[in-house]
C-alpha cells in the first residue's frame, strides 16, 4: 500500500486490487483495479 | 467456510527448493479462489500467490514471480506451492487461505478461511 500527502493536509491511500477476471467472466487472467479512499477507479 | 491444513515446510539452503501443499476439506473447494500467503519473524503478513477456482488463472507478488508456483488439484482438494531458488527472506511461516469468488485476491481481508501455517526456513 502506497501514501501519498497531498497539499491540502490530508492523506489518500492507493491501493491495488487484483480480481481474477473468470470470477466476472469467461476470460482467464487477472484484472488489476486501484482503490483510492474506498473507492475502485480503475 | 472450508478447512485448510498446511505441510511441507522445513529447513532449506538458499538456492534449494520445497513444496507446500494445503489440505482442504468441505465439498465447496471449488468454490473458492485459493492463496498462499506468509509472515516472517516481526512482520505483517503479505500475499504471496494465488490460483482462480479453475486453476486457470495465477497472481503472483512481485518478490516470488518466476521463482514459485501455485496449482491446485480440484479433484483432491488440494493447494500446491512449489518453491524455487529459495532466498534466505523467504524464511517465514507460510499459510494457506480461501477467499469467495469475486473477492480481491491479493488482500488478506478477502480470506475467510485459514490454514494453521508451516514454516519454511531458508538458512545454510
Known amino acids: 500500500d502506497a501514501e501519498f500527502r497531498h497539499d491540502s493536509g490530508y492523506e489518500v491511500h492507493h491501493q491495488k486490487l487484483v480480481f481474477f477476471a473468470e470470477d466476472v467472466g469467461s476470460n482467464k487472467g487477472a484484472i488489476i483495479g486501484l482503490m483510492v479512499g474506498g473507492v475502485v477507479i480503475a | 467456510e472450508v478447512q485448510l491444513l498446511e505441510s511441507g515446510g522445513g529447513l532449506v539452503q538458499p538456492g534449494g527448493s520445497l513444496r507446500l501443499s494445503c489440505a482442504a476439506s468441505?465439498?465447496?473447494?471449488?468454490?473458492?479462489?485459493m492463496g498462499w500467503f506468509r509472515q516472517a519473524p516481526g512482520k505483517g503478513r503479505e500475499f504471496v500467490a494465488a490460483?482462480?477456482?479453475?486453476?486457470?488463472?495465477?497472481y503472483y507478488a512481485d518478490s516470488v514471480k518466476g521463482r514459485f508456483t501455485i496449482s491446485r488439484d480440484n479433484a483432491k482438494n488440494a493447494v500446491y506451492l512449489q518453491m524455487n531458488s529459495l532466498r534466505p527472506e523467504d524464511t517465514a511461516i507460510y499459510y494457506c487461505?480461501?477467499?469467495?469468488?469475486?473477492?480481491?485476491?491479493?488482500?488478506?481481508?478477502?480470506?475467510?478461511?485459514w490454514g494453521q501455517g508451516t514454516l519454511v526456513t531458508v538458512s545454510s
Open positions: 468441505g465439498r465447496t473447494f471449488n468454490n473458492y479462489n
Open positions: 490460483v482462480s477456482r479453475s486453476g486457470v488463472s495465477t
Open positions: 487461505a480461501a477467499a469467495y469468488r469475486g473477492t480481491a485476491i491479493n488482500v488478506r481481508r478477502s480470506y475467510d478461511s
